[in-house]
């Protein structure tokens, strides 16, 4: 399955919007920083084929979308930027979903990447737990925003490596 040429441009636009969403200086939230244990190995792109990689990327984008479409998220961010950000994510989800479906049709087994998807789910569980513990404070959201920028940029790198493999 070939992702549309525009897909990596959408990724960069998503990152740009997330960067613009910053409301307070991260430097005022130094003590709130947290290691969420991003499952780096699932995004290294060396040890697995394209099909599982796409479904792990899909899971990552889906979880980010879920996180930023909550009621608490709406209260934390600029409405217009949040709306644009979520629209971009939704578009990427559609692109990735079409690829996931196509791979399933040609018989790619979903079992081969179940562990990777579980690792992504656990990562977002840790993020949600952190936000809850910090009572969705502005600094907690700022820390999460920086973390999502890191994971999004890593996933962008993976997608570009996958495209080069085609």
């Amino acid at each position: 399955c070939d992702l549309p040429e525009t897909h990596s441009l959408d990724n960069r636009r998503t990152l740009m919007l997330l960067a613009q969403m910053s409301r307070i200086s991260p430097s005022s939230c130094l003590m709130d920083r947290h290691d969420f244990g991003f499952p780096q190995e699932e995004f290294d792109g060396n040890q697995f084929q394209k099909a599982p990689a796409i479904s792990v990327l899909h899971e990552l984008i889906q979880q980010i979308f879920n996180l930023f479409t909550t009621k608490d998220s709406s209260a934390a961010w600029d409405e217009d930027l949040l709306d644009k950000f979520c629209t971009e994510l939704y578009q990427q989800l559609n692109d990735l979903e079409a690829c996931v479906m196509q791979e399933e049709r040609v018989g790619e087994t979903p079992l081969m990447n179940a562990d990777s998807i579980l690792a992504v789910k656990k990562y977002f569980r840790r993020i949600t737990l952190y936000l809850t513990e910090k009572k969705y404070s502005p600094c907690a959201w700022e820390v999460v925003r920086a973390e999502i920028m890191r994971s999004l940029s890593l996933s962008t790198n993976l997608q570009e490596r996958l495209r080069r493999k085609e």
Epitope: L15, P26, S27, M31, R33, G37
Partner: antibody
Framework: QVQLQESGTVLARPGASVKMSCKAS????????MHWVKQRPGQGLEWIGV????????TYNQKFKDKAKLTAVTSANTAYMELSSLTNEDSAVYFC?????????????WGQGTTVTVSS | DIVLTQSPASLAVSLGQRATISCRAS??????????MHWYQQKPGQTPKLLIY???NLESGVPARFSGSGSGTDFTLNIHPVEEEDAATYYC?????????FGSGTKLEIK
């Protein structure tokens, strides 16, 4: 590729002000924090402060709060640092550096440095 | 401010041997799983270059002979085996709290 092009050598009188520039290319200027670092001849490095070009947000080392002023012009992809009330202690090389990995606050790309010499 | 004390101030190491540089912080720079200590290399007449971030993560493109370790207040940069091109001054930097500060540097000479 990422490049940070700094303005050239500056010679200034004690008490004067100087404004140096750092033109960024090869990346999205508005989405990366930009640090400024001082290095006196034969000495170590000192962190002056950081600016977020996207919204002009700044954070300073208290030591430089009344000495340095950080600004950015996004349309020109350029960050600026103005130093005021210059003394001999301000004679140094000043680097602009791009922030790395968001809130890890480390520096991956460095400009070539602007040499400021304060002399009467 | 957190003071970073680097030792030794200078060292001379034979080609192929191990160079060990220490950086001690006056206060812990580790929090919630991350150690906010980073290492740079500066060669004469050049700009500093990022080697290691978050105490032990090797920056992309940096040779694997460089490694970092430590947490809390004590951190170490190891270079093994040392090569000719490693002659430089090495600085640690923390980003645990404001203001960010650098160590005074360690000058490495290759014998």
């Amino acid at each position: 590729q990422v490049q940070l092009q700094e303005s050239g050598t500056v010679l200034a009188r004690p008490g004067a002000s100087v404004k140096m520039s750092c033109k960024a290319s090869g990346y999205s200027f508005t989405t990366y924090w930009m640090h400024w670092v001082k290095q006196r001849p034969g000495q170590g490095l000192e962190w002056i402060g950081v600016i977020y070009p996207g919204n002009g947000d700044t954070t300073y080392n208290q030591k430089f709060k009344d000495k340095a002023k950080l600004t950015a012009v996004t349309s020109a992809n350029t960050a600026y640092m103005e130093l005021s009330s210059l003394t001999n202690e301000d004679s140094a090389v000043y680097f602009c550096t791009r922030n790395y990995k968001y809130d890890y606050y480390t520096m991956d790309y460095w400009g070539q440095g602007t040499t400021v010499t304060v002399s009467s | 401010d957190i003071v970073l004390t680097q030792s030794p101030a200078s060292l001379a190491v034979s080609l192929g041997q191990r160079a060990t540089i220490s950086c001690r912080a006056s206060k812990s720079v580790s929090t919630s799983g991350h150690s906010y200590m980073h290492w740079y290399q500066q060669k004469p007449g050049q700009t500093p270059k990022l080697l290691i971030y978050l105490a032990s993560n090797l920056e992309s493109g940096v040779p694997a002979r460089f490694s970092g370790s430590g947490s809390g207040t004590d951190f170490t940069l190891n270079i093994h085996p040392v090569e000719e091109e490693d002659a430089a001054t090495y600085y640690c930097q923390h980003s645990g709290e404001l203001p960010f500060t650098f160590g005074s540097g360690t000058k490495l000479e290759i014998k």
